[in-house]
């Protein structure tokens, strides 16, 4: 999916609003500090482009955030905000329903929430440079 | 600390496929970071071909999308690069490097290909 | 796509001096731009990030500075081994990231 056409400043309230706050309550007892960050973006499709691919790709070491509360927010903000998103999701939908069900939180799966919450702030930040 | 090292063949014919592996050591290519192919042709200036990231976001420039796949192997802590339908314009050092998807921290030595019949 | 143009192409310098290298973007990169070192025969070596960050392990003598459009990388005292060709890259225009052609900085 290209997010060029998104509406930026509407994603970026709803991450303020409830995505975020959902993201730290995951990573509660955790300090910032505990993880490196790998990952970067550049510009703002680039990094609606990683928080996507990071929050609904399972990986080997963490299977389950697409179930998450954050997750799901994350892709009804994507959905209302980019055009066209919510009609190339349903591989993204079939990969949460196939997901593990276990609400057990692993290391590895809150580094890749570290990540993506680095991710997010820089998407922020990309907004605030163009303004 | 992190090593990379490309492979593959020297010589490649106008019109095939070039395919490139890298073997990462000391760092697991699932754990974190992009990981990236960037070229250069003989006394010229660095082309940025394309990263994977760990969770398996793919990006490649625009001007050699069509002809370009990064796949990785996570069992052999290796990636790759297939370039089709080369020409002699694709003749360069081929490096791989590890990168924050922005810029690249590690670089493997290099491996020239040369595109001729 | 962003065309990254350094100047100048060739800087003759000796040990001990001050050498000054331009990279300018055609249009605003922001302070998304890195610098790399690459000696003959040898990997390009990340040298500086977003503009003015020094990479790990790289010597103080090594600076960068600027935002937007014009960046320069700066090398306090040069040493002998300092002698290469340096590459600015701008990482603000993905897809499409870009580097300059390069700046050889030889022995006068």
């Known amino acids: 999916y290209d997010f060029t056409n998104c509406d930026f400043q509407k994603i970026e309230a709803d991450y303020l609003r409830t995505i975020s706050k959902d993201l730290i309550t995951y990573m509660s007892g955790t300090k910032s500090t505990d993880f490196n960050n790998t990952v970067s973006c550049s510009n703002r499709p680039h990094c609606l482009t990683e928080i996507q691919s990071l929050t609904f790709n399972p990986t080997p070491r963490c299977a389950s955030l697409a179930k998450e509360m954050f997750a799901r927010k994350t892709k009804a903000t994507l959905a209302l905000w980019c055009p066209g998103y919510s009609e190339t999701q349903i591989n993204a939908t079939q990969a949460m329903k196939k997901a593990r069900k276990s609400k057990v939180t692993t290391n590895k799966c809150l580094e890749q929430v570290s990540q993506l919450l680095g991710l997010w702030r820089r998407f922020i930040r990309t907004l605030l440079k163009k303004q | 600390q992190v090593q990379l090292q490309e492979s593959g063949p020297g010589l490649v014919k106008p019109s095939e496929t070039l395919s490139l592996t890298c073997t990462v050591s000391?760092?697991?290519?699932?754990?974190?970071?992009?990981w990236s192919w960037i070229r250069q042709p003989p006394g010229k200036g660095l082309e940025w071909i394309g990263y994977?990231?760990?969770?398996?976001?793919?990006s490649y420039n625009p001007s050699l999308k069509s002809r370009v796949t990064i796949s990785v192997d996570t069992s052999k802590n290796q990636f790759s690069l297939k370039l089709s339908s080369v020409t002699a314009a694709d003749t360069a050092v081929y490096y791989c490097?590890?990168?924050?998807?922005?810029?690249?921290?590690?670089w493997g030595q290099g491996t020239l290909v040369t595109v001729s019949s | 796509e962003i065309v990254m143009t350094q100047s100048p192409a060739t800087l003759s310098l000796s040990p001990g001096e001050r050498a000054t290298l331009s990279c300018r973007a055609s249009?605003?990169?922001?302070?998304?731009l890195a610098w790399y070192q690459q000696k003959p025969g040898q990997a390009p070596r990340l040298l500086i990030y977003?503009?003015?960050s020094r990479a790990t392990g790289i010597p103080a003598r090594f600076s960068g500075s600027g935002s937007g459009t014009d960046f320069t990388l700066t090398i306090s005292s040069l040493e002998p081994e300092d002698f290469a060709v340096y590459y600015c890259?701008?990482?603000?225009?993905?897809?499409?990231?870009?580097f300059g052609q390069g700046t050889k900085v030889e022995i006068k």
């Open positions: 890259q701008q990482y603000s225009d993905w897809p499409q990231y870009t």
């Open positions: 977003d503009a003015s």
């Open positions: 249009q605003s990169v922001s302070n998304n």
């Open positions: 994977i990231s760990y969770y398996g976001s793919i």
């Open positions: 490097a590890r990168t924050n998807l922005l810029y690249f921290d590690s």
């Open positions: 000391g760092y697991s290519i699932s754990s974190g970071y992009g």
